[in-house]
């Protein structure tokens, strides 16, 4: 190796200056005794190199690039060798930004996978390899005092979410949770969440069904629908409230919301609808009165109201 580049910093803030030095060893005897060292950034020759011969006979060229505006580029020092440029050494330069504070951190507890899934927004592009780590600890109180640390959760590349498995969770006990972002230019941390995994539980929705007509029960009135639902069994012991939404299958009508319904209602007569009309219905539930997240909407149930003109317009519960 005849030449060697050293730089003030291989990674800098975008737009910052960078200084580089290229030294050519004296024992490269096949070279011109007073060679002219050239600099190139990417494909472009860079003027402004200051060259000197050092006391030990080596040649040194120093260049300052006033603004590195490329997020990634190769800086090389070279010599003219005949009609071609002979590259002596090159280094990769990177420029970008320190990570912004991750924001909108939120978590939900999935009881089926037994994991706490947290997601966040990473903020603007840094142009540098940036790692995110979901950090957490158990706390007896309101997260002012830190208990046992929980193993860091590292998302897969490019993902802004991470799952903490059940073995690291304690239900009905608070956890402090935050995201740390780190790259070569700095570290940032999101505001800390303090939560009990059960308070962010997201249940599966019930399954909507048509109510089986029983011989003794009156048929639904015109403009009414009779439906029932089967709760998601693993969430059955969690107090919940639910809501229905419905809209005619045809046309551009928006969803109409009906609720809150107690999960235990299990059957419902929905009235005040258009006669002889096909409707799409869905249901969702949330842990209540304790905190939780709404479930997704259930798969749709499609039902048709009876032919005759409606006689009354009200919502009515049947337990």
């Amino acid at each position: 190796e005849c030449g060697h580049i050293s730089v003030s910093a291989p990674i800098v803030h975008l737009g910052d200056p960078i200084t580089a030095s290229c030294i050519i060893k004296q024992n490269c005897s096949h070279l011109d005794p007073e060679p002219q060292i050239l600099w190139r950034l990417g494909a472009e020759l860079q003027p402004g190199g200051r060259q000197q011969r050092l006391s030990d006979g080596t040649q040194e060229s120093i260049i300052t690039l006033p603004h590195l505006n490329h997020t990634q580029a190769f800086l090389s020092c070279a010599l003219n060798w005949g009609n071609s440029l002979q590259i002596l050494d090159q280094v990769e330069l990177r420029a970008g930004y320190p990570p912004a504070i991750p924001h909108n951190l939120s978590c939900l507890m999935n009881l089926t996978t037994s994991s706490l899934i947290c997601q966040w927004e990473p903020g603007p592009e840094t142009h540098l390899p940036t790692s995110f780590t979901l950090k957490s600890f158990k706390s007896r109180g309101n997260c002012q005092t830190q208990g046992d640390s929980i193993l860091d959760c590292v998302p897969k590349d490019g993902q802004s979410h991470c799952s903490i498995p059940r073995k690291h969770l304690l239900l009905y006990q608070n956890m402090g949770i935050w995201v740390q972002a780190e790259n070569a230019l700095g570290t940032s941390m999101s505001p800390q969440l303090c939560l009990d995994p059960m308070d962010v539980v997201k249940l599966e929705p019930p399954m909507l069904r048509t109510m089986d007509p029983s011989p003794e029960a009156a048929p639904p009135q015109a403009g009414c629908l009779q439906l029932s639902w089967e709760p998601w069994q693993p969430g059955l012991h969690i107090n919940q409230k639910c809501e229905l939404r419905h809209k005619p299958q045809r046309g551009e009508a928006s969803w109409a919301l009906v609720g809150p319904l107690p999960l235990e209602a299990l059957q419902y007569e929905l009235c005040g609808l258009l006669p002889a009309t096909a409707y799409t219905l869905q249901i969702r539930c949330i842990r209540w009165p304790l905190p939780g997240h709404w479930s997704d909407w259930s798969p749709s149930l499609e039902l048709r109201t009876t032919e005759r003109a409606p006689t009354h317009h009200h919502h009515h519960h049947h337990h």
Partner: antibody
Amino acid sequence: EVQLLESGGGLVQPGGSLRLSCAASGFTFSLYWMGWVRQAPGKGLEWVSSISSSGGVTPYADSVKGRFTISRDNSKNTLYLQMNSLRAEDTAVYYCAKLGELGWFDPWGQGTLVTVSS
Amino acid sequence: DIQMTQSPSSLSASVGDRVTITCRASQGISSYLNWYQQKPGKAPKLLIYYASNLQNGVPSRFSGSGSGTDFTLTISSLQPEDFATYYCQVSWEYPLTFGGGTKVEIK
């Protein structure tokens, strides 16, 4: 402190009836599912029935379905088990218990013994 | 219905021993598995809920693990007061089934 106190057990003839009660204190009774679990002499635990917080959902074990009825009176903080058409195999200590959100039983009452024998 | 197979049905151990009891469900039950301790003439007492959560007031020598179909209750160092019968219970769906029990006796 959460407390559950069963009563109503005793000796009854096959085919007879008995009503067990469980008085609850120390928690908001109306917010929790409750349940009955029994244990025959020298045997393991067997779930009998549960009831939702407002009483609308009442699952039963196949072995008691159609014969036992679970109910609750939230104004009295009391859980009941009406047992009809009793059989010798219903002989057991009957425990009432509060159900946790993910279906565990805690705490349990001290139990009341039901003996079905002629 | 979900069947719970608990093993062993009984075991003899000494104070200080590490004891492991297993429960196998006939189908996947996520983490909906609870463990109880019962002493003669007493009501059962909850030890572990949702497979691995230690109930308040239960000594940390008790731990639970597993998910899906296979679950384990471990007592890291058996104490004299731990000699009792232990039951697992599934709460994924009705009926709420108990395992057959494991009696831990003094060797």
